[in-house]
């Protein structure tokens, strides 16, 4: 099952993944890979951590900007392009046979939305973003249609992943567009 996240070309994409170190400070290796989680490890690795720090990044655009030492291993991809679209695997490599937690997150990169005058803004956004978030068969199905463009902060507990989607609200406010 995949959690879906939308980002605009040129912006930073945030792909959430976290775990709770037990006991606190007892970190485990984590890898992020492009493509659905395979049987073992990560294929097409974009970033890897060991028990202490990030030790492998395939590009300077990949970052862990959260509190890594508290188990926030959410991936930030800077300056995304359409080629960054696709499924990413966050694999929390808990010691033991077949103990890994595997989280698939789908990144959808879109071209920047055109900010139009207020009367057509809501209609354009609704047609452009009919589905802000969907989760797979094992997770809660949520559909956000941006009528009032709310901020969403959803915790998908069965993935131990906290998905935070900050909609276009703030950007639109900053642009001076009217939101109704």
């Amino acid at each position: 099952s995949e959690v879906e996240y939308i980002a605009e070309v040129g912006q930073n994409a945030y792909l959430p993944c976290s775990y709770t170190p037990a006991p606190p400070g007892n970190l485990v290796p984590v890898c992020w890979g492009k493509g659905a989680c395979p049987v073992f490890d990560c294929s097409n690795v974009v970033l890897r951590t060991d028990n202490r720090d990030v030790n492998d990044r395939t590009s300077g655009r990949y970052w862990l900007k959260g509190d890594f030492h508290k188990g926030d291993v959410s991936l930030t991809i800077e300056n995304v392009t359409l080629a960054d679209s696709g499924v990413y695997c966050c694999r929390i490599q808990i010691p033991g046979i077949m103990n890994d937690e595997k989280h698939n997150v789908k990144l959808v990169v879109i071209k920047p939305a055109k900010v139009t005058p207020a009367p057509t803004l809501q209609r354009d956004l609704t047609s452009a973003f009919p589905r802000m978030l969907t989760t797979g068969e094992h997770g809660p199905a949520e559909t956000q249609t941006p009528g009032s463009l709310p901020d969403v902060n959803l915790t998908v507990s069965n993935f131990f992943c906290e998905l935070q989607i900050f909609t276009l609200t703030n950007e639109l406010r900053d642009s001076g567009a009217t939101i109704r």
Partner: antibody, heavy 116, light 107 residues
Framework: EVQLVESGGGLVQPGGSLRLSCAAS????????MSWVRQAPGKGLEWVAN????????YYVDSVKGRFTISRDSAKNSLYLQMNSLRAEDTAMYFC?????????WGQGTLVTVSS | ETVMTQSPATLSVSPGERATLSCRAS??????LAWYQRKPGQAPRLLIY???TRATGIPARFSGSGSGTEFTLTISSLQSEDFAVYYC?????????FGGGTKVEIK
């Protein structure tokens, strides 16, 4: 250049044992999972076993569980497969492969023949 | 386990022609599928991984497609060195499994 060189194959009687070795070079051995894959005469490829970078996890196809043991020595850049209680159906060419879930580099293989 | 079925078992093609090989999985393997080429007396060679990504040094005439349960390997214009046996392999589900192979022979 990545190189994987297998050795240790040969003719063995049913119930016997063999130890295969694979010498790796040209890459950071300790950074990769490693696998053994085999191909019986006239048959297709079959994954046999693999081992994590630090040796902490090992996985086997059901048909060899309890009989085969995979191990590695990162100081020697070597991978091993200890094969006990060998059966006629274990007759195959055994390949050592670098494991990225898919197998991006392979050795030339070593032939194991189990026959009385 | 995930059973991988390849078809046809044998494909007779003339040099310069297009070859299309099929691989079907008994359950979804997402895009976690690889293709290999095996020639007699040689080690298998990785051609494609992640369903459609060519491995290092693989000519552009080899291409892969598909996701879920249906996959295709296409050789756009067969060269003499392409006559071999081709295997698909899934790495989405445990255990790792291969297809039975497709032999591409000269027509």
């Amino acid at each position: 250049e990545v190189q994987l060189v297998e050795s240790g194959g040969g003719l063995v009687q049913p119930g016997g044992s063999l130890r295969l070795s694979c010498a790796a070079s040209g890459f950071t051995f300790s950074s990769y999972w490693m696998s053994w894959v085999r191909q019986a005469p006239g048959k297709g490829l079959e994954w046999v076993a693999n081992i994590k970078q630090d040796g902490s996890e090992k996985y086997y196809v059901d048909s060899v569980k309890g009989r085969f043991t995979i191990s590695r020595d990162s100081a020697k850049n070597s991978l091993y497969l200890q094969m006990n209680s060998l059966r006629a159906e274990d007759t195959a060419m055994y390949f050592c492969a670098r494991d990225s879930n898919f197998f991006d580099y392979w050795g030339q293989g070593t032939l194991v023949t189990v026959s009385s | 386990e995930t059973v991988m079925t390849q078809s046809p078992a044998t494909l007779s093609v003339s040099p310069g022609e297009r070859a299309t090989l099929s691989c079907r999985a008994s359950q979804s393997v997402s895009s976690n599928l690889a293709w290999y080429q095996r020639k007699p007396g040689q080690a298998p060679r990785l051609l494609i991984y992640f369903s459609s990504t060519r491995a290092t040094g693989i000519p552009a005439r080899f291409s892969g497609s598909g996701s879920g349960t249906e996959f295709t390997l296409t050789i756009s214009s067969l060269q003499s060195e392409d006559f071999a046996v081709y295997y698909c392999q899934q790495y989405n589900n445990w255990p790792l499994t291969f297809g039975g192979g497709t032999k591409v022979e000269i027509k």
